[in-house]
């Protein structure tokens, strides 16, 4: 997102309240190009040995307040007969990002950036198998 | 410029199914969610569902979990409404809608489809 | 669910009128209101998105104020293109939930 200062001068960068003289542009620009969604796979969330579904994570004190996360379908991965492998797990790979939450009670809204964990897919790993002494 | 054009009427009978498309255009179909929502004569309107043609993830008004199935072909940029179980209630207008996800609000809407469940 | 009581459910206005619609949410929906206009055998057209914000294109007697739970919508001076039904919508959370619709017919 683009910061922009609330006055036509500048604020100072070094001064401590810096950052409650800025605001912030949430228009989302797609520096990548139009045609990079269009390429994103939707269907490797059936297609994998560790499949997943999607679910809407809302909150509407929270920009973006739509989140689309996974969540692994099986404990165990899938092998190719379609059967559960017992000696693979299926597990959650997650992205840290970056998200702004709305501070309760306060008007004129004011936000503070908070990280999330955010669930993206499912991986298949070996279990681990520990020996008996 | 951005368009949803939805498919024709549709006369069904009690514990039919329906499918609905409706195919998008002048935008990438994979960057917005589709929600369909319904209106039956003289009534209000009722949100049933969503999809992301991006993802693939759906979710459901609890009213309709059951019976609708939502999808999305991105080869042909258009998102489907199965609602199964048909009974003279389904009567009514289905639109689908584009939501922006980051803005927070439905801009454009399909011309709308309707279902009439009759026996 | 949220419900959204909108009044009043008809209203008989003239051509340059001012006229008012309020939207009632049954919780907190904070700015997350939109307004919509639709004609007969029309599909829903947005006026006003986040409670007060004029959608592109939308003249300027069209306008919206409110937060939390009480919105209102306002059209300064009606033309004879706005006749039609007009409806609020809150995407806070889901299911989205509509109000009933006022119809707006000339006097």
């Known amino acids: 997102a683009a910061i922009i200062p609330q006055s036509s001068a500048c604020p100072n960068t070094e001064a401590k309240d810096f950052l409650q003289n800025v605001k912030v542009n949430l228009k989302v620009f797609n520096s990548l190009g139009a045609k990079v969604s269009s390429r994103r796979p939707s269907d490797y969330l059936n297609r994998s040995t560790s499949p997943w579904t999607l679910h809407r994570n809302e909150d509407p004190d929270r920009y973006p307040s739509v989140i689309w996360e996974a969540q692994c379908r099986h404990q165990r991965c899938v092998n190719a007969e379609g059967k559960l492998d017992h000696h693979m797990n299926s597990v959650l790979i997650q992205q840290e990002i970056l998200v702004l939450k709305r501070e309760p009670e306060s008007c004129p809204f004011t936000f503070r950036v908070e990280k999330m964990l955010v669930g993206v897919g499912c991986t298949c790993v070996a279990s681990i198998v520990r020996q008996a002494a | 410029e951005v368009q949803l054009v939805q498919s024709g009427a549709e006369v069904k009978k009690p514990g039919a199914s329906v499918k609905v498309s409706c195919k998008a255009s002048g935008y990438t179909f994979t960057d917005y969610e589709f929600h369909w929502v319904r209106q039956a004569p003289g009534q209000g309107l009722e949100w049933i569902g969503v999809i992301h043609p991006g993802n693939g993830g759906t979710a459901y008004n609890q009213n309709f979990r059951d019976r609708a199935t939502l999808t999305a072909d991105k080869s042909t940029s258009t998102a489907y409404m199965e609602l199964s179980s048909l009974r003279s209630e389904d009567t009514a207008v289905y639109y689908c809608?584009?939501?922006?996800?980051?803005?927070?609000?439905?801009?454009?809407w399909g011309q709308g489809t309707l279902v009439t469940v009759s026996s | 669910d949220i419900q959204m009581t909108q009044s009043p459910s008809s209203l008989s206005a003239s051509v340059g009128d001012r006229v008012t619609i309020t939207c009632k949410a049954s919780?907190?929906?904070?700015?997350?209101v939109g307004w919509f206009q639709q004609k007969p055998g029309k599909s829903p057209k947005l006026l006003i998105y986040?409670?007060?914000n004029r959608y592109t294109g939308v003249p300027s007697r069209f306008s919206g104020s409110g937060s939390g739970t009480d919105f209102t919508f306002t059209i300064s001076s009606l033309q004879p293109e706005d006749f039609a039904t007009y409806f609020c919508q809150q995407d806070y959370s889901s299911p989205y939930t509509f109000g009933q619709g006022t119809k707006l017919e000339i006097k």
């Open positions: 986040h409670a007060s």
């Open positions: 809608t584009r939501f922006l996800t980051y803005e927070g609000y439905f801009d454009y």
């Open positions: 919780q907190s929906v904070s700015i997350d």
